[in-house]
């Protein structure tokens, strides 16, 4: 039976059919971050749980040292949510000399690192000013989109301030990717 | 022609090929919630429209009694947005004795229920402090991620306060899942 | 070899198998918007980058004149993030006569246009009151969900105020869709 008998008329003959169940996939969940040095003007990367609870990696998608390693070229949907929480925000203080303070902010970046390319690529960024009146505040930033990745690419999640990340529950802060 | 001639070299032979069009999928949209009693310390579950307007269920993914029923084991992408709106928030009142009030909050949880397991599992949570200065406020919480589910699992969306959910438009508050 | 030997027992025989790599897909990124006339009570549509940087269209998914053109009927996952930024918000001013002002707001709508249907359909809406105490504020609205689309449907992203859209970085404001 010819393969193209299954295929819509526009399918390229050479495109391989593929079982969905064997595609690279990962869902990583938050863990408490270990104190690490990071450069002043560089957002620190989060590290993740990859096998306990809701977390998993499968079909050659591996997690190592804060990175998800892309095992196969293709189009991937990549997503992350980071829940931040804090205990006041400077700009809620009384304005000095009638001039509002620069607002605090929280930022999440999903970054791609390609060994053959010197600079990391920012794939997705969610950034929000935080100017809360109440004493303690909390809020999530969610990101998700599709990107063409190459075998060997590495993905990480960077945040503006690691100390504000809510690491208490695996459903609040997470990171995942799957081959489409 | 042998099936594996279509397959990339890393494909497990036993993985079945599968037509995408017959995978379980659902997109549910908000309806006005009917007045029901719910326990004080338990977040109430939303019920949904499953066939009118933009809403649909297909390929054995069924909606019944606030639950999406998973018909087949596999990896699913699950998502929801809930738009909340309210007409004040207590912490916007003048601070008593110079001390800010504990903020109000809004929370969405996507929950999995497995009959063989006594406790529901929280898959995703979006939670946000609400401390609005203006009189009426509104904002969405969006969630989405991939999970390995088993046939017979049930999914629901719980919220911290059903009365704050914006039920007026199907594009503002919704819930969906699809087999990858 | 018979096709159904690949298929789970519940697969409809007539459903064509399909190589994932040839499915219509697009990820569009923000560009600076050119000033255009738009009607007072109609949210303006954003236009997008479709080939430079992270942006791409493939497999007959075309971008033209603010629209993504759907080349094939099926279920699509559609997503967008718009990052807004501004320089104060009226409702942070002192309340007049004890009555809070109506809050400002930011809104994103993903809209479907079907030539045979007179009215556009709003698929997704993210709307948020903005009542910031600080001077300059910024925040994203993210949307994503699955919809059944028909060949020839057109998708666009509309916003409440084009002048508040952050067009500075391709990772902050984007729009995409892919056939499932």
């Amino acid at each position: 039976l010819k393969g193209q008998e299954f295929a819509p008329s526009h399918q390229q003959v050479y495109a391989p059919l593929r079982a969905d169940g064997d595609k690279p996939r990962a869902h990583l969940t938050v863990v408490r971050q270990t104190p690490t040095q990071h450069f002043k003007n560089q957002f620190p990367a989060l590290h993740w749980e990859h096998e306990l609870g809701l977390a998993f990696t499968k079909n050659r998608m591996n997690y190592t040292n804060k990175f998800l390693l892309i095992p196969e070229s293709g189009d991937y949907f990549i997503y992350s949510q980071v829940t931040f929480r804090g205990m006041t925000s400077e700009c809620s203080e009384i304005r000095q000399a009638g001039r509002p303070n620069k607002p605090d902010s929280i930022t999440v970046v999903i970054t791609k690192v390609t060994d053959s390319y010197p600079e990391p690529t920012q794939l997705l960024m969610g950034t929000k000013s935080v100017c809360e009146v109440g004493s303690n505040w909390f809020q999530p930033i969610y990101l998700g989109a599709m990107f063409s990745l190459q075998e060997g690419d590495k993905l990480m999640v960077n945040v503006s301030d690691i100390s504000l990340v809510d690491y208490t529950k695996e459903d609040k802060t997470f990171f995942g990717a799957f081959l489409l | 022609l042998k099936g594996q001639e279509f397959a990339p070299s890393h494909q497990q032979v036993y993985a079945p090929l599968r037509a995408d069009g017959d995978k379980p999928r659902a997109h549910l949209t908000v309806v006005r919630q009917t007045p029901t009693q719910h326990f004080k310390n338990q977040f109430p579950a939303l019920h949904w429209e499953h066939e009118l307007g933009l809403a649909f269920t297909k390929n054995r993914m069924n909606y019944t009694n606030k639950f999406l029923l998973i018909p087949e084991s596999g990896d699913y992408f699950i998502y929801s947005q809930v738009t909340f709106r309210g007409m004040t928030s207590e912490c916007s009142e003048i601070r008593q004795a110079g001390r800010p009030n504990k903020p109000d909050s809004i929370t969405v949880v996507i929950t999995k229920v497995t009959d063989s397991y006594p406790e529901p599992t929280q898959l995703l949570m979006g939670t946000k402090s609400v401390c609005e200065v203006g009189s009426n406020w509104f904002q969405p919480i969006y969630l989405g991620a991939m999970f390995s589910l088993q046939e017979g699992d049930k999914l629901m969306v719980n919220v911290s306060d059903i009365s704050l959910v914006d039920y007026t438009k199907e594009d503002k508050t919704f819930f969906g899942a699809f087999l990858l | 070899l018979k096709g159904q030997e690949f298929a789970p027992s519940h697969q409809q025989v007539y459903a064509p198998l399909r190589a994932d790599g040839d499915k219509p897909r697009a990820h569009l990124t923000v560009v600076r918007q050119t000033p255009t006339q738009h009607f007072k009570n109609q949210f303006p549509a954003l236009h997008w980058e479709h080939e430079l940087g992270l942006a791409f269209t493939k497999n007959r998914m075309n971008y033209t004149n603010k629209f993504l053109l759907i080349p094939e009927s099926g279920d699509y996952f559609i997503y967008s993030q718009v990052t807004f930024r501004g320089m104060t918000s009226e409702c942070s001013e002192i309340r007049q006569a004890g009555r809070p002002n109506k809050p400002d707001s930011i809104t994103v709508v993903i809209t479907k246009v079907t030539d045979s249907y007179p009215e556009p359909t709003q698929l997704l809406m993210g709307t948020k009151s903005v009542c910031e105490v600080g001077s300059n504020w910024f925040q994203p609205i993210y949307l994503g969900a699955m919809f059944s689309l028909q060949e020839g449907d057109k998708l666009m992203v509309n916003v409440s105020d084009i002048s508040l859209v952050d067009y500075t970085k391709e990772d902050k404001t984007f729009f995409g869709a892919f056939l499932l």
Epitope: - | Q37, H38, G86, N136, S163 | -
Partner: antibody, heavy 119, light 111 residues
């Protein structure tokens, strides 16, 4: 202009049912929820429930659950409220009211229908 | 179950100002959809007067205003007129979005 016109007064015996109609005009009937509110003689207003004319979905006050049924006929832009197992304390003026979607305030009211329950 | 409490009656002379309060038994009155006020003149159906604490529908004179503080909302009528005499109801919602009405306040215009 928006109008809600209700059916005429009814006299019913205890244990019977009554069905009150509310014909809408001047707007798209399926775009706004209809509520029913009653007022016993000399008493205050009491909410009974809401009806979405588009989907047919309803929400009833706990007090009336099991006894009230709200329906809509989209072809005639008419909402109905049926109350069963009537008792003397159901004697009241019954109002239909159209809601403002954003705030659920009752913006337009019918003129009211007096239902008297007497043996 | 939340309860909205209004004074049974208030009165004032023409030209005066009167305020009708509406107090909730729960922590924050109308947190979801606000508090609405209705006027019911003798022998007529209720009429929406104030929507969402503060907002007057078109056609409602600016003599009518609404406010909110903590667990109570208020309707204030300035420059009282004889034709304002009637019953006034506040309305809000409980946690399941069931509508609640206050018991009503009878306004008498003296003289």
């Amino acid at each position: 202009q928006v109008q809600l016109v209700q059916s005429g007064a009814e006299v019913k015996k205890p244990g019977a049912s009554v069905k009150v109609s509310c014909k809408a005009s001047g707007y798209t009937f399926t775009s706004y929820d209809i509520n029913w509110v009653r007022q016993a003689p000399g008493q205050g207003l009491e909410w009974m429930g809401w009806l979405n004319p588009n989907s047919g979905n309803t929400g009833y006050a706990q007090k009336f659950q099991g006894r009230v049924t709200m329906t809509a006929d989209r072809s005639t832009s008419t909402a109905y409220m049926e109350l069963s197992s009537l008792r003397s304390e159901d004697t009241a003026v019954y109002y239909c009211a159209r809601e403002v979607p954003e705030t659920a305030a009752f913006e337009y009211w019918g003129q009211g229908t007096l239902v008297t329950v007497s043996s | 179950q939340s309860v909205l409490t209004q004074p049974p009656s208030v009165s004032g002379a023409p030209g005066q100002r009167v305020t009708i309060s509406c107090t909730s038994s729960s922590s924050d009155i109308g947190a979801a959809l606000g508090v609405h006020w209705y006027q019911q003149l003798p022998g007529t159906a209720p009429k929406l007067l104030i929507e969402g604490y503060y907002n007057r529908p078109s056609g409602v004179p600016d003599r009518f205003s609404g406010s909110k503080s903590g667990t109570s909302a208020s309707l204030t009528i300035t420059g009282l007129l004889p034709e304002d005499e009637g019953d006034y109801y506040c309305q809000s919602f409980d946690g399941t979005l069931s509508a609640l009405f206050g018991g009503g306040t009878k306004l008498t215009v003296l003289g």
